[in-house]
C-alpha cells in the first residue's frame, strides 16, 4: 500500500508563517497589474531567472528574487479592444500572456505571448556578459506568433529552440481547435503534424519538448514530446485521457509530395504510470501535468520523471513514475498501432513495414537517406496512416515510485536534483502541488536500484494563499528552487539541515542526502569535505550505528513535525 | 497608404442573394479584424459583422445574422460579405472597413438596392 | 431608434466652438472607448478621435472628445466652413455584444 506507508508523513510540516520566520524562503509577491507567473528560463551563467508573465517579463537574481528588473510588453489597446469584442475577459483574456521564454542565442531571448488572442513574438537583448546589465525589448522586430504561442492563456504550449528553429506544441488558432507540433524560425520552411487527424494529435494539451541525442551522431537527434490527450475511439471505452511520449527527427524537413511541410517522422507512444487495484483492475495516472528530465554522464539515456493524476473526480491522486529512454526507444521499434478487424479495433500492425522504417532519421547511422525529401512514397503513406505504436512504454519496475490517494492536493510540477551523500547519490525529488505546497522527497534503493523506497522529508508551504504551483526550476550552483503560480514566485534553499534539530539521531533520522551531523550540529554535507566524524545514514536512517553523542535518547520520534 | 476598394453591389430581387468583395492594400492585411458597416439612404450608419484576423471568429448584427457570411482570403487580401435571403431593408452602402480597435480606414462604399 | 443618442443637428458661426454630445449606457459608453467619425457629404466616414480623446495624425487639433460617465462630447473649436458634415459618435456594446453608433448629427456652419 504506498500511499500510506510511514515514509509518507514529512519528517517536517513548514508552514509558509514557519517559512519565513525561518528565513527559509523569499517571495516575490507580484505586481498590481501582473499576475500568471508560469514561463521560466534559469540562466545558471548569467545568474538570472526569466519569468514571462501577464504583460512582463522579468530577470530576478538567483541569489535573491527581490532584486529583479523587468519589461513591460502589453497589448496596443486596440489589441485589448478586439479582444474584448470576441467575448473575452478584459483582465483573465485580453492581456499579453507569455508563453514562450527561450534562449535565442549569446545575446538575445525569445520570448512569445498570447497578444489577446493575438500570439506575438520579439526578441530580448539580454547583452553578451552579465555585467553588461542588459534587459530590453526589441521594440523593432516583432513577428507573427501563430504556432508558437497559444491564443488562449488557459493554454500551455511546448517549446524548444535549438539551433535557431523553434519547435513547439501548441493550439495554432483562435478557437483552440488546431492543435499542432511546429518547427518554425530559421531557414526552413515551417513543419507541423497532419491537420484535422485525430490519429495523429486529438485535443492534445502539451507539456514539455526536450532534445535527446540517439547517437554519436547529430544527424540522429530526436526532439520529443510529452502531452496528453483523448484517447482516440476504439483505443478505449468511454471517454478517456492518455499521457503520451512523441518523437520527431531533428532533421526531418517534411516529404517531397506527400506530407509537405508535415513531419514524416513523427511518432507517438502511450505512457502508462498505473498501479494493481484490489479487483484486477488497475488504477491509471493518466493526465500528465509534468516532466523532468534528469541527465546523468549519457545525455542519450536521461532518465524521465513525470507526474501524473487521475482523471476521475471521484477518485482524487497524484503519481510519479519514472521512464528509461531505452524502453521508450524499445517501444518506438516496436508494432505501430493499426486499425483492423470488424470492431475496428486497434491490433498491432502485422503487415511488411517498409524500409527504411517510419520513424528513423535520415542519416549515415541507419541507411542511406540524406533528407526526409527523399524517402520512398510506401515509408511516408505508411508514416501518414500510422502515427501511434501499439505497445506502450511502462515505467521503471513497473509502478510508480511514489503515490498520494489521500490528501486534499495533487501534484503539479516536478524537478529532481541528484545528491551525493556518504553512502551513494540519491535523487531527490522537489514536488508542487495546487495547493501551494512543495515535498522534498528522496528515493532509497532498497536492494536493487530498481526497489525504491520513498522518504518524504519536508512539506513546505511556499505562497501565503493557496495557489497552484504552475513552475519549478531548481540552481544546483545556488542550490536554491524558484517556484512559479498565479501570485507570483518564491525562492527557498534546497537544503534546511539545521530545523532538523539539535542532535545527531535527529540529524541522522531525518535522512536528508543534504545534512550530516558534524559533531556540533547538522550541516550541509559535502562528499569532498575530509571530515571523518560526519554522521549520516539516508539508506537506514539508522542514528544508533551513527552516533556516539548519547544524544539518541528520547528523540527516535521519526514523524516529528514543526507545527 | 491603406485603401479599401468595394465591389459587387448592385441591385436585386428581394430573397435574392449578393457577394461583395473588399480589396485590400497599403497595409498588412493578415494581421487586421475586418469589418462591414452600412448606410441605408439618407440614413445614419449600421455596423453589420466583423472577423477576426485569421477567421477565427466572426461576428454579425442581429439584424444580419443567418442570413449574411462575412469571410476573407488573407492570401489575395480580400474581404468578403456573402449576403442572402435579402430585404428591402438591407438597401444601403456597404463599406469595408478595416478594424483597429474602432474603424480607422474605410472603403468608399458600394450600393445594394433590393427591389420588391 | 440607435443605442447612442446625438442631438440631430447642431450649429456655428466660424471661429466658434461647437459641442456634439453623445448619450449611453454603461454596457457602452460606461465601459468602452468611444470613437467620433466625420462624413463630408457624399463621402465615406473618416475616424476622427479614437479612445475617447486622442486624434489619429492628420486630424486637426481643433478636434477634442471626452468622456463622463456614460456621455461623451466632440468639442469642435475655431469651426470652419469644411468642418460642415455628418458626425457619428460609436461604442463597442458589451450586452450587444456589437459595435453601436448615435444616430449621427449634421453640423451646418452658418454665415
Known amino acids: 500500500n504506498y500511499q500510506n506507508g510511514k515514509n509518507n508523513v514529512p519528517r517536517l510540516k513548514l508552514s509558509y508563517k514557519e517559512m519565513l520566520e525561518s528565513n527559509n524562503v523569499i517571495t516575490f509577491n507580484g505586481l498590481a497589474n501582473s499576475s500568471s507567473y508560469h514561463t521560466f528560463l534559469l540562466d545558471e551563467e548569467r545568474s538570472r531567472l526569466y519569468v514571462g508573465a501577464k504583460d512582463h517579463i522579468f530577470s530576478f537574481n538567483l541569489v535573491n528574487i527581490k532584486d529583479f528588473q523587468k519589461i513591460v510588453w502589453p497589448v496596443s489597446y486596440t489589441r485589448r479592444d478586439e479582444c474584448k469584442w470576441a467575448g473575452k475577459d478584459i483582465l483573465k483574456e485580453c492581456a499579453n500572456f507569455i508563453k514562450v521564454l527561450k534562449a535565442y542565442n549569446q545575446t538575445h531571448l525569445y520570448a512569445c505571448g498570447t497578444g489577446a488572442f493575438h500570439p506575438i513574438c520579439t526578441y530580448i537583448e539580454i547583452g553578451h556578459h552579465p555585467e553588461d546589465n542588459i534587459f530590453k525589448l526589441e521594440n523593432s522586430h516583432f513577428e507573427n506568433g501563430r504556432g508558437k504561442s497559444p491564443y488562449d492563456p488557459k493554454l500551455l504550449t511546448a517549446s524548444l529552440l535549438i539551433d535557431g528553429e523553434l519547435y513547439s506544441g501548441t493550439a495554432a488558432d483562435f478557437m483552440g481547435r488546431d492543435f499542432a507540433i511546429f518547427r518554425t524560425l530559421g531557414h526552413h520552411h515551417p513543419i507541423r503534424t497532419e491537420q484535422h487527424d485525430s490519429r495523429w494529435l486529438n485535443d492534445p494539451r502539451f507539456i514539455s519538448a526536450h532534445l535527446i541525442p540517439e547517437s554519436d551522431n547529430p544527424e540522429d537527434d530526436k526532439v520529443y514530446f510529452f502531452f496528453r490527450e483523448n484517447a482516440i475511439d476504439g483505443e478505449h471505452s468511454g471517454k478517456a485521457t492518455h499521457a503520451r511520449i512523441g518523437q520527431i527527427c531533428k532533421n526531418d524537413f517534411g516529404g517531397h509530395r506527400s506530407l509537405v511541410n508535415k513531419w514524416t517522422t513523427f511518432l507517438k507512444a502511450r505512457l502508462i504510470c498505473s498501479v494493481p487495484g484490489p479487483n484486477g483492475i488497475d488504477t491509471h495516472f493518466d493526465e500528465l501535468q509534468d516532466v523532468f528530465l534528469m541527465n546523468f554522464k549519457d545525455p542519450k539515456n536521461p532518465i524521465v520523471y513525470g507526474v501524473f493524476t487521475t482523471s476521475s473526480n471521484i477518485f482524487k491522486g497524484s503519481a510519479v513514475c519514472m521512464y528509461s529512454m531505452s524502453d521508450v526507444r524499445r517501444v518506438f521499434l516496436g508494432p505501430y498501432a493499426h486499425r483492423d478487424g470488424p470492431n475496428y479495433q486497434w491490433v498491432p500492425y502485422q503487415g511488411r513495414v517498409p524500409y527504411p522504417r517510419p520513424g528513423t532519421c535520415p542519416s549515415k547511422t541507419f541507411g542511406g537517406f540524406d533528407s526526409t525529401k527523399d524517402l520512398p512514397d510506401d515509408v511516408i503513406t505508411f508514416a501518414r496512416s500510422h502515427p501511434a505504436m501499439y505497445n506502450p512504454v511502462f515505467p521503471i519496475n513497473n509502478r510508480p515510485i511514489m503515490i498520494k490517494t489521500d490528501v486534499n492536493y495533487q501534484f503539479t510540477q516536478i524537478v529532481v536534483d541528484r545528491v551525493d551523500a556518504e553512502d551513494g547519490q540519491y535523487d531527490v525529488m522537489f514536488i508542487g502541488t495546487d495547493v501551494g505546497t512543495v515535498l522534498k522527497v528522496v528515493s532509497i534503493p532498497k536492494e536493487t536500484w530498481h526497489d525504491l523506497e520513498e522518504v518524504l522529508l519536508e512539506e513546505m508551504t511556499v505562497f501565503r494563499e493557496p495557489t497552484t504551483i504552475s513552475a519549478m526550476e531548481l540552481s544546483t550552483k545556488q542550490q536554491q528552487l524558484y517556484i512559479g503560480s498565479t501570485a507570483g514566485i518564491a525562492q527557498l534553499p534546497l537544503h534546511r539541515c539545521d530545523i532538523y534539530g539539535k542532535a545527531c539521531a535527529e540529524c541522522c533520522l531525518a535522512r536528508d542526502p543534504y545534512c550530516a551531523w558534524d559533531g556540533s550540529s547538522c550541516s550541509r554535507y559535502f562528499p569532498t569535505a575530509k571530515a571523518r566524524t560526519r554522521a549520516q545514514d539516508i539508506r537506514n536512517g539508522d542514528p544508533l550505528t551513527h552516533c556516539s553523542d548519547g544524544g539518541i535518547e528520547g528523540r527516535m520520534d521519526h514523524h516529528h513535525h514543526h507545527h | 497608404e491603406v485603401q479599401l476598394l468595394e465591389s459587387g453591389g448592385g441591385l436585386v430581387q428581394t430573397g435574392g442573394s449578393l457577394r461583395l468583395s473588399c480589396a485590400a492594400s497599403g497595409f498588412t492585411f493578415s494581421d487586421y479584424a475586418m469589418s462591414w458597416v452600412r448606410q441605408a439612404p439618407g440614413k445614419g450608419l449600421e455596423w453589420v459583422s466583423w472577423i477576426y484576423y485569421d477567421s477565427g471568429s466572426k461576428y454579425y448584427a442581429d439584424s444580419v445574422k443567418g442570413r449574411f457570411t462575412i469571410s476573407r482570403d488573407n492570401s489575395k487580401n480580400t474581404l468578403y460579405l456573402q449576403m442572402n435571403s435579402l430585404r428591402a431593408e438591407d438597401t444601403a452602402v456597404y463599406y469595408c472597413a478595416k478594424l483597429n480597435g474602432d474603424f480607422d480606414y474605410w472603403g468608399q462604399g458600394t450600393l445594394v438596392t433590393v427591389s420588391s | 431608434q440607435s443605442v447612442l443618442t446625438q442631438p440631430p443637428s447642431a450649429s456655428g458661426t466660424p471661429g466658434q466652438r461647437v459641442t456634439i454630445s453623445c448619450s449611453g449606457s454603461s454596457s457602452n459608453i460606461g465601459n468602452n472607448d468611444v470613437s467620433w467619425y466625420q462624413q463630408l457629404p457624399g463621402t465615406a466616414p473618416k475616424l476622427l478621435i479614437y479612445?475617447?480623446?486622442h486624434r489619429p495624425s492628420g486630424v486637426p487639433d481643433r478636434f477634442s472628445g471626452s468622456k463622463s460617465g456614460t456621455s461623451a462630447s466632440l468639442a469642435i473649436s475655431g469651426l470652419r466652413s469644411e468642418d460642415e458634415a455628418d458626425y457619428y459618435c460609436g461604442a463597442w456594446d458589451s450586452s450587444l455584444s456589437g459595435y453601436v453608433f448615435g444616430g449621427g448629427t449634421k453640423l451646418t456652419v452658418l454665415g
Open positions: 479612445a475617447d480623446s
